[in-house]
Amino acid sequence: MMTGTIETTGNISAEKGGSIILQCHLSSTTAQVTQVNWEQQDQLLAICNADLGWHISPSFKDRVAPGPGLGLTLQSLTVNDTGEYFCIYHTYPDGTYTGRIFLEVLESSVAEHGARFQIP
């Protein structure tokens, strides 16, 4: 039975040209995290594997940095980066947990963080 919960940074916004940290946290389970995949609408951004460490997708080598923790830092943001991002936690023995973050990249100099929310 999957008892865990993914907490994410929720809906967030950031300035064009700036950077943003995408964060997910898995709680309420003792399952072992074997791998975390970060995706943007079905495209792989990065993998953090328990044994192999961080690996960044070739399309994003120059704009994505690993961490902090199991999170991901997106740099040199463009308006095209607006959209849904998913953290996919592969765990043993529970299986897969998925968290969703929506990022809006703004042209203006005003960019506020949204509230945190949970996905069971």
Partner: antibody, heavy 128, light 113 residues
Framework: QVQLQQSGPGLVKPSQTLSLTCAIS??????????WNWIRQSPSRGLEWLGR?????????DYAVSVKSRITINPDTSKNQFSLQLNSVTPEDTAVYYC??????????????????WGQGTMVTVSS | DIVMTQSPDSLAVSLGERATINCKSS????????????LAWYQQKPGQPPKLLIY???TRESGVPDRFSGSGSGTDFTLTISSLQAEDVAVYYC?????????FGQGTKVEIK
């Protein structure tokens, strides 16, 4: 040793779908130490990468922008093979098509590698 | 896309002499996180698929004769055949695997003078 064996028709009519298959022996299409690619070669375009499929706890695809609206690369785990479908072909799609394994060195880069194993190539002509 | 440009387009070298092929990428293929150059070299003979010779810019693939060597970093790379043999007559390609789409050079044809 790892081998890739291509199959599929050598002649396709314009506007129809080009379909090729690449059978893998000595490795698994679900390997987490490889990606499975399609590349084509023509006198006018040289060697042109079309796309790849790979498994890293789930399946992913990457496609070249030039063909993204027309291409599908699918793994078939039951037959240990992967396929290329290219829709709405034109004579400009005439080329030798190759499948290739992208071998990754996981402790350096788990998502990028050089093409260490190639299929024999299939000459595909698009003509009515 | 990263554009790969090779020079020369063709090269005629006497048997036993050195052959040098250059490859330039439109942007760096050196990844600072692992200090690796994402550059490969291939040999293609007529009617055959390309064959991997060199990866990570300078690592020889298993079974490749040691007369083949690769060097360079960042944007400028070289494939050297130290002593050309008759069986080395082929077209040679560089390829970057730093950023998708993977891209190849236009090829350099090596012939015997």
């Amino acid at each position: 040793q790892v081998q890739l064996q291509q199959s599929g028709p050598g002649l396709v009519k314009p506007s129809q779908t080009l379909s090729l298959t690449c059978a893998i022996s000595g490795d698994s299409v679900s390997s987490n130490s490889a990606a499975w690619n399609w590349i084509r070669q023509s006198p006018s375009r040289g060697l042109e990468w079309l796309g790849r499929t790979y498994y890293r706890s789930k399946w992913y695809n990457d496609y070249a922008v030039s063909v993204k609206s027309r291409i599908t690369i699918n793994p078939d785990t039951s037959k240990n093979q992967f396929s290329l479908q290219l829709n709405s072909v034109t004579p400009e799609d005439t080329a030798v098509y190759y499948c290739a394994r992208e071998g990754v060195l996981r402790y350096f880069d788990w998502l990028s590698g050089a093409f260490d194993i190639w299929g024999q190539g299939t000459m595909v002509t698009v003509s009515s | 896309d990263i554009v790969m440009t090779q020079s020369p387009d063709s090269l005629a070298v006497s048997l036993g002499e050195r052959a040098t092929i250059n490859c330039k990428s439109s942007q760096s293929v050196l990844y600072s996180s692992n200090n690796k150059n994402y550059l490969a070299w291939y040999q293609q003979k007529p009617g055959q698929p390309p064959k991997l010779l060199i990866y990570w810019a300078s690592t020889r693939e298993s079974g490749v004769p040691d007369r083949f060597s690769g060097s360079g970093s960042g944007t400028d790379f070289t494939l050297t055949i130290s002593s050309l043999q008759a069986e080395d007559v082929a077209v040679y390609y560089c390829q970057q695997y730093y950023s998708t789409p993977w891209t190849f050079g236009q090829g350099t044809k090596v012939e015997i003078k």
